[in-house]
Amino acid sequence: GSTVPPMVNVTRSEASEGNITVTCRASSFYPRNIILTWRQDGVSLSHDTQQWGDVLPDGNGTYQTWVATRICRGEEQRFTCYMEHSGNHSTHPVPSGNSHHHHHHHH
């Protein structure tokens, strides 16, 4: 099939006092090969500080996955979700505290 670029969605949730969990979800993409990782100050976080979901079919012939990490509240601007798929790439910031969703569809 032809390439379908992912929809990327960054959310945040309270983790513990002073910390938040930020989750980057990529959905509705094809083929299934994708790089999704959190970057801190432009550098990819080490693997042991991130949690990844499996790349799973979403029922429409496309795929979905996610990556999450825990960060200190107030440090959000230093973190970006990096996505690379079929030769295209994009970076996605953590939404501010009053905006819990950040959607981008990449073509």
């Epitope: 801190q40 100050d41 432009g42 550098v43 990819s44 976080l45 080490s46 500080t49």
Partner: antibody, heavy 121, light 108 residues
């Protein structure tokens, strides 16, 4: 004024160990990632290691992985590079360099004057 | 790891001449994560061009940068004496971070 001052270089025998230090001043050390970069005599720049501001992310060049350890003491504004199993090819000027973040761009904005390490018998 | 090969290794240019050097990566690098540094003998490197094409503060407008994927270049529109230096490309798209092999620009 931002200042990075390296120390600890000198002459070491092959197989020996050495610990380099980088003393920082003039900025809030605990909010910046720092790198070690080296330059062999008459050669180019070689990235050695990186430690994020909170020490949660650490990376090494393949040439030093397993032999060098980067660490930092934020309360003392000091960066370290513990080097073991030293080889002649580790002979170089070692720089510490601050990793800036400005407007979504990250880059080396301040460098120390360097400390020279010579590995020779 | 991503290896960055710069060419030529050394070049001589006359004053006023247009100079172009290249940086070739073994795998694709996002332009956001590709910078150029200038280093003069006895001095630490200085950020020269960031994110492939943006001039750092204080860099003369005769410099420009371009490229994408595995091929990047730095151009000096009209060589001046103060431009004699070694230029390094640098990527942090993938860890380990790497510098290019360097291009030394001399005055002919």
């Amino acid at each position: 004024d931002v200042q990075l001052v390296e120390s600890g270089g000198g002459l070491v025998q092959p197989g020996g160990s050495r610990k380099l230090s980088c003393a920082a001043s003039g900025f809030t050390f605990s909010t910046f990632g720092i790198h070690w970069v080296r330059q062999a005599p008459e050669k180019g720049l070689e990235w050695v290691a990186y430690i994020s501001y909170d020490s949660r992310t650490i990376y090494y060049a393949d040439t030093v992985k397993g032999r060098f350890t980067i660490s930092r003491d934020n309360p003392k504004n000091t960066l370290f590079l513990q080097m073991t199993s030293l080889r002649s090819e580790d002979t170089a000027m070692y720089y510490c360099a601050r990793w800036a973040y400005e407007g979504g761009v990250n880059y080396f904005d301040n460098w120390g004057q360097g400390t020279t390490l010579t590995v020779s018998s | 790891q991503i290896v960055l090969t710069q060419s030529p290794a050394i070049m001589s240019a006359s004053l006023g001449e247009r100079v172009t050097m290249t940086c070739t990566a073994t795998s694709g690098v996002s332009s956001s994560y590709l910078h150029w540094y200038q280093q003069k003998p006895g001095s630490s490197p200085k950020l020269w061009i960031y994110s492939s094409s943006n001039l750092a503060s204080g860099v003369p407008a005769r410099f420009s940068g371009s490229g994408s994927g595995t091929s990047y270049s730095l151009t000096i529109g009209s060589m001046e004496a103060e431009d004699a230096a070694t230029y390094y490309c640098h990527q942090f798209h993938r860890s380990p971070l790497t510098f290019g092999t360097g291009t030394k620009v001399e005055i002919k």
